[in-house]
């Protein structure tokens, strides 16, 4: 059979393309990319709104905050900021709204000091179970990471091709446990509808969690016993019904938790009396004076603090033989 | 060594079907995203369209859409062109191409369609 | 849509020439990459973003340019240059990847 041609005679079969991306001539000291900013004293580069379609080759080694902002970058491949000598310094990264629809395994290895990574606004379809942990190992090297904001990061619907995205983004916060030492991460406006079970729990240095303006309906199997450093859960514009009590006393036995439960559409039935009766008593949700019931239409905005156990009842279910059509 | 060898290409009438296959080697397949590129006797290179590493994301040329589907068994290692709704100017060597860290860096060996009645 | 011009369409050139191949965007765009074609084989990547070469390319080799304006430049042609040159990109959302229309050039 025919071999292809290529760019190069050979290379380990692992990482075969990642010879193009070190090999880039190292950078002079003072010198920034075409169509970026740079300041060697603020040790920062910005590359914003410049339609990139790629990373820049030649970023200055001093580089410690990067901002690549409003481009055209749609595929971050392996390595993409793999350089000889590596960034060694880049702590923060944003490639928020990047039209980036493609995030490969491997994508921000290298980066030793990666603290911050801002992947919001991209419609990622494509996210690599491995963009995060860089390799597919049952237990990878930790990642530096402290603080992931991936808001909107859904793409269109006849994008998702019928998978589950929660899936998709899940996988890759949990591969190779990489992702340990992370404190920040931010998941609002991505139309989830559950969270995975085991997410919370593989995640323990959660300082804050930002799950708000999504579509989670029930956090039954969600469990936060684990986040015992957990200082604040944001879980507003969501479509809530009511918290049961295991939820409940998980978020109570949280030590320094804030919780934010805003325009929730809080059911307001017999299932809601014991979420009434804690949230008369608790001091970690904030707002709470501002909760209101959205069903059943008799009780549309009545504040949940106001609620007594009268209030709350069922309608008796009716059996077979009484029921009319 | 990375290795592409496109195969599937013959003589196809107007209105016809067929579809091409790249089987790749040499570099983890699933990790990469593919492109095909077509180039008509005597003439210049034209991308056909784009498929991801994990399968979900696929672009087009507007001059294939809606008769071409890009798909891939990353299990298989194989890269697949299945056309349809075949026109003469349809004519060209197919190659396959991996997008690793650049666009088009490697390239197999190409594969020819010809549509003729 | 973007269109990439190259001039010129063909070009001959003697040994030890200084040999510039221009690629002209119709819009802007940040980089540019370039592919040597020769006849009967497939193209091989051989400048990426610009100005760095791929593996294996010989020095005489470099590349330039910004906005609408890149080109590829020989220091001294030798035979084995003797191919068909194209410049990429890649422009929009869902991104379309353009190639030039191609320069062939031809050893004296």
């Known amino acids: 059979s025919s071999s292809p041609t290529s760019s190069a005679s050979s290379f380990s079969s692992s990482a075969p393309f990642l010879a193009s991306a070190v090999s880039a001539q190292p950078p002079l000291p003072d010198q920034c990319p075409a169509l970026c900013e740079c300041s060697e004293a603020a040790r920062t580069v910005k590359c914003v709104n410049r339609n990139l379609t790629e990373v820049p080759t030649d970023l200055p080694a001093y580089v410690r905050n990067l901002f690549l902002t409003g481009n055209q970058l749609a595929v971050l491949p392996a390595g993409a900021f793999a350089r000889r000598p590596p960034l060694a310094e880049l702590a923060a990264l944003n490639l928020s709204g990047s039209r980036l629809d493609e995030v490969r395994a491997g994508a921000f290895e290298h980066l030793p000091s990666l603290r911050q990574l801002d992947l919001s606004h991209n419609p990622l379809a494509d996210l690599s179970p491995f963009a995060f942990s860089g390799s597919n190992a049952s237990v990878s090297a930790p990642s530096p990471l402290v603080e992931l904001i991936l808001n909107h990061i859904v793409p269109p619907e006849d994008e998702r091709q019928n998978r589950s995205f929660e899936g998709m983004v899940v996988a890759a916060l949990l591969a190779g446990r990489a992702l340990q030492g992370l404190r920040r991460l931010e998941l609002a406006s991505n139309h989830f509808l559950y969270l995975p079970r085991d997410v919370l729990a593989q995640l323990p240095s959660l300082r804050h969690l930002d799950l708000s303006n999504n579509s989670l309906v029930s956090l039954t199997y969600v469990s936060f016993r684990n986040l015992t450093h957990l200082e604040s859960l944001h879980l507003e514009d969501n479509a809530l019904k009511v918290l049961h009590n295991g939820t409940l006393a998980e978020l109570q036995g949280l030590p320094h938790i804030r919780v934010f439960l805003d325009n929730n559409p809080w059911v307001c039935d017999c299932h809601m009396a014991d979420m009434v009766t804690w949230l008369k008593e608790t001091e970690v949700v904030q707002g709470k004076d501002r909760l209101t019931c959205a069903y059943p239409e008799k009780m549309r905005n009545r504040v949940l603090l106001e609620l007594n156990s009268a209030d709350l009842d069922c309608d008796p279910i009716l059996p077979p033989s009484l029921q009319t059509s | 060594e990375v290795q592409l060898v496109e195969s599937g290409g013959g003589l196809v009438k107007p209105g016809g079907s067929l579809k091409l296959s790249c089987a790749a080697s040499g570099f983890t397949f699933s990790d990469y995203g593919m492109h095909w590129v077509r180039q008509a006797p005597e003439k210049g290179l034209e991308w056909v369209g784009y498929?991801?590493?994990?399968?979900?994301?696929?672009y087009y040329a507007d001059t294939v859409k809606g008769r071409f589907t890009i798909s891939r068994d990353n299990a298989k290692n194989t890269l697949f062109l299945q056309m349809t709704s075949l026109r003469s100017e349809d004519t060209a060597i197919y190659y396959c191409s991996t997008y690793g860290s650049n666009p088009f860096d490697y390239w197999g060996q190409g594969t020819t369609l010809t549509v003729s009645s | 849509q973007l269109v990439l011009t190259q001039s010129p369409a063909i070009m001959s050139a003697s040994p030890g020439e200084k040999v510039t191949i221009t690629c002209s965007a119709t819009?802007?765009?940040?980089?540019m990459h370039w592919f040597q074609q020769k006849p009967v084989t497939s193209p091989k990547l051989w400048i990426y973003s610009t100005s760095n070469l791929a593996s294996g390319v010989p020095t005489r080799f470099s590349g330039s340019g910004s906005g609408t304006s890149y080109s590829l430049t020989i220091s001294r042609m030798e035979a084995e240059d003797a191919a068909t040159y194209y410049c990429q990109q890649r422009s929009g959302y869902p991104p379309i990847f353009t190639f030039g229309s191609g320069t062939k050039l031809e050893i004296k």
């Open positions: 819009s802007s765009v940040s980089s």
């Open positions: 498929i991801s590493s994990g399968t979900y994301v696929v």
